[in-house]
């Protein structure tokens, strides 16, 4: 058993049929010595008396808010949550496996630049009685500070018969050094509590590996005289690290119709302009990637050909 | 060339070669990018590699103030990785294809380090750790880790030379 926060405790349980459970001793936070009784949740049934209460925690019915009273007055509370371990593996019932970039990916994180700011998100089908708390650091043995905000519900989607909820959190490294080569990964830890179930999820990454630039901005077309060709130009996204002579991007320019199966024109360039062949009813799209490190491509920025 | 005394390197040449190094480092093992090597635990294997750190003056402002600190750091790293790529880790079993990008990567590391330090001048170099994995699978894992680390190192070096070529070239 360990303390998650004031008056909230997590009991770690091996979860299998007829498991003996865990013996837990609760102590009433009071100078009083006698006349103390214990109840669980809203029940008025007295579970025991005295300053301490010893219970055998085996299942969710044994978890909940234990309260000690004296003469009708509440003295203190202890909330017990359960953390299940099945076949040596901690349960992951609360969050959905996003399976990208690999199986058992519950947290996904992205950064728009090298400033040390990043966003993580996760998915769940649970809509109520759900709380998250997020902590982060650079490195684990001698951790350096990363400050995370509160996790918020950022999207709701319908998937078949189910509703899916996306939560996200923004974090910022306290003393970021955008130009340095990272040697210690960022660690992100998410505590998830659904009713009386506790789970924790972690992710470890270098900012450089989660970089995904915003799409290029200000796409413009200039038809070339006596030619089917069009010069397309664009600018670096505002959110990308500066100076651009240092933090350089490379680009992919593509001309394609509405369907992915249609013929297309495609060219890669380090410049902020390219010459392509435009067709009626097609669009010109441009996306960006770090020039020197193969992290994710941005989403496409597009303009119609006509 | 970046002489320890302080003259400027051939920024444009360094830029071209460092960008080539980036391409080669990813070609040498593109799949490395999809392996989460941190799960493999034995951190000490690549902890000893030289990293370009915050105080090394490799940021745009530091380069403007005095690029020598940064260039020395990059030079140290290039020599270090060049030795690693020439070591038993990469020459032992399982043997690499004669024409794998690792060979070109090795040569290009040497080429860039020579651009930065002409004959007869010496910056102190970091000792290469004695990593001699006994099993082929350990060697393979170590190669992945070294290449992954090299990808990060050459990315910073390439940014330095790109910025230098754009803003510090005579």
């Amino acid at each position: 058993i360990w303390e998650l926060k004031k008056d909230v405790y997590v009991v770690e349980l091996d979860w299998y049929p007829d498991a003996p459970g865990e013996m837990v001793v609760l102590t009433c936070d009071t100078p009083e010595e006698d006349g103390i009784t214990w109840t669980l949740d809203q029940s008025s049934e007295v579970l025991g008396s005295g300053k301490t209460l010893t219970i055998q925690v085996k299942e969710f019915g044994d978890a909940g808010q234990y309260t000690c009273h004296k003469g009708g007055e509440v003295l203190s509370h202890s909330l017990l949550l359960l953390h299940k371990k099945e076949d040596g593996i901690w349960s992951t019932d609360i969050l959905k496996d996003q399976k990208e970039p690999k199986n058992k990916t519950f947290l996904r994180c992205e950064a728009k630049n090298y400033s040390g700011r990043f966003t993580c998100w996760w998915l769940t089908t649970i809509s109520t009685d759900l709380t998250f708390s997020v902590k982060s650091s650079r490195g684990s043995s001698d951790p350096q500070g990363v400050t995370c905000g509160a996790a918020t519900l950022s999207a709701e989607r319908v998937r078949g018969d189910n509703k899916e909820y996306e939560y996200s959190v923004e974090c910022q490294e306290d003393s970021a050094c955008p130009a340095a080569e990272e040697s210690l990964p960022i660690e992100v830890m998410v505590d998830a509590v659904h009713k009386l179930k506790y789970e924790n999820y972690t992710s470890s990454f270098f900012i450089r590996d989660i970089i995904k630039p915003d799409p290029p901005k200000n796409l413009q077309l200039k038809p070339l005289k006596n030619s089917r060709q069009v010069e397309v130009s664009w600018e670096y996204p505002d959110t990308w690290s500066t100076p651009h002579s240092y933090f350089s991007l490379t680009f992919c320019v593509q001309v394609q119709g509405k369907s992915k199966r249609e013929k297309k024109d495609r060219v890669f360039t380090d410049k902020t302009s390219a010459t392509v062949i435009c067709r009626k009813n097609a669009s010109i799209s441009v996306r960006a990637q770090d020039r020197y490190y193969s992290s994710s491509w941005s989403e496409w920025a597009s303009v119609p050909c006509s | 060339r970046a002489v320890p005394g302080g003259s400027s390197p051939a920024w444009t040449q360094c830029q071209q070669l460092s960008q080539k190094l980036c391409t080669l480092a990813w070609s040498a093992h593109p799949l490395v990018g999809h392996m989460d090597l941190r799960e493999e635990g034995d951190e000490e294997t690549t902890n000893d590699v030289p990293h370009i750190q915050c105080g090394d003056g490799c940021d745009p402002q530091g380069l403007r103030d005095n690029s020598q600190f940064c260039l020395q750091r990059i030079h140290q790293g290039l020599i270090f990785y060049e030795k690693l790529l020439g070591s038993d880790i990469f020459t032992g079993e399982p043997s690499l294809l004669p024409d794998s990008p690792v060979g070109q990567l090795h040569a290009s590391l040497l080429g860039l380090s020579q651009l930065l330090q002409p004959e007869g001048h010496h910056w102190e170099t970091q000792q290469i750790p004695s990593l001699s994995p006994s099993q082929p699978w350990q060697r393979l894992l170590l190669r992945f880790k070294i290449l992954r680390s090299l990808q990060a190192f050459v990315a910073v070096a390439a940014r330095v030379f790109a910025h230098g070529a754009a803003t510090l070239s005579p």
Epitope: K263, D265, V267 | -
Partner: antibody, heavy 118, light 107 residues
Framework: EVQLQQSGADLVRSGASIKLSCTAS????????MHWVKQRPEQGLEWIGW????????EYAPKFQGKATMTADTSSNTAYLQLSSLTSEDTAVYYC???????????WGAGTTVTVSS | DIVLTQSPATLSVTPGDSVSLSCRAS??????LHWYQQKSHESPRLLIK???QSISGIPSRFSGYGSGTDFTLSINSVETEDFGRYFC?????????FGAGTKLELK
């Protein structure tokens, strides 16, 4: 299966013109760019140009401007290359290509050998 | 026009050897470079697109890398069916141009 059937070998007199055909099967040429590439005996490859059969748009390599004319007939699913004022320099194998992507060649015809005699 | 220089012009190898073919562009072309194989009396066929992207149906012993001006096609353990000519082609700008080719022959 995506295939390109090119017209047979031809022997033509210097100064004459010739029209080569390239008929597609297994796909509609409107959905592809059609290119022509020249290869002289024991030599490299030279790009002549492309046509978009959907709208008739064309682009030629400067070297072949005035020498080559590309057309396409979507009803017969065929692309054509006309070569005019033939000289011995035009003796070559001419390949047609069908390309989903404009700038590289993924489906090649078997080629048509053109021999120009004086 | 962008000029592509291939080297060597001829490469004599024994089956089982691994080889590298080089293609150099007269100016930077990012990764807009493609590789073709042409066997005797056959049409060329696409091996690699955009410097390093594999093509379905092409054996995995063919791989490419490079960007900017220097590109390499590698064949890991040459097989007898690999003998022929290899061309690089740039798609950075029109006119599209090819290298003169490297002939891979039996030693």
């Amino acid at each position: 299966e995506v295939q390109l059937q090119q017209s047979g070998a031809d022997l033509v007199r210097s100064g004459a013109s010739i029209k080569l055909s390239c008929t597609a099967s297994g796909f509609n040429i409107k959905d592809y760019y059609m290119h022509w590439v020249k290869q002289r005996p024991e030599q490299g490859l030279e790009w002549i140009g492309w046509i978009d059969p959907e709208n008739g748009d064309t682009e030629y390599a400067p070297k072949f401007q005035g020498k080559a004319t590309m057309t396409a007939d979507t009803s017969s699913n065929t692309a054509y290359l006309q070569l005019s004022s033939l000289t011995s320099e035009d003796t070559a194998v001419y390949y047609c290509n069908a390309c989903k992507e404009l700038r590289y060649f993924d489906v090649w015809g078997a080629g048509t050998t053109v021999t120009v005699s004086s | 026009d962008i000029v592509l220089t291939q080297s060597p012009a001829t490469l004599s190898v024994t089956p089982g050897d691994s080889v590298s073919l080089s293609c150099r562009a007269s100016q930077s072309i990012s990764i807009n470079l493609h590789w073709y194989q042409q066997k005797s009396h056959e049409s060329p066929r696409l091996l690699i697109k955009f410097a390093s992207q594999s093509i379905s149906g092409i054996p995995s012993r063919f791989s490419g890398y490079g960007s900017g001006t220097d590109f390499t096609l590698s064949i890991n353990s040459v097989e007898t069916e690999d003998f022929g000519r290899y061309f690089c082609q740039q798609s950075n700008s029109f006119p599209l141009t090819f290298g003169a080719g490297t002939k891979l022959e039996l030693k």
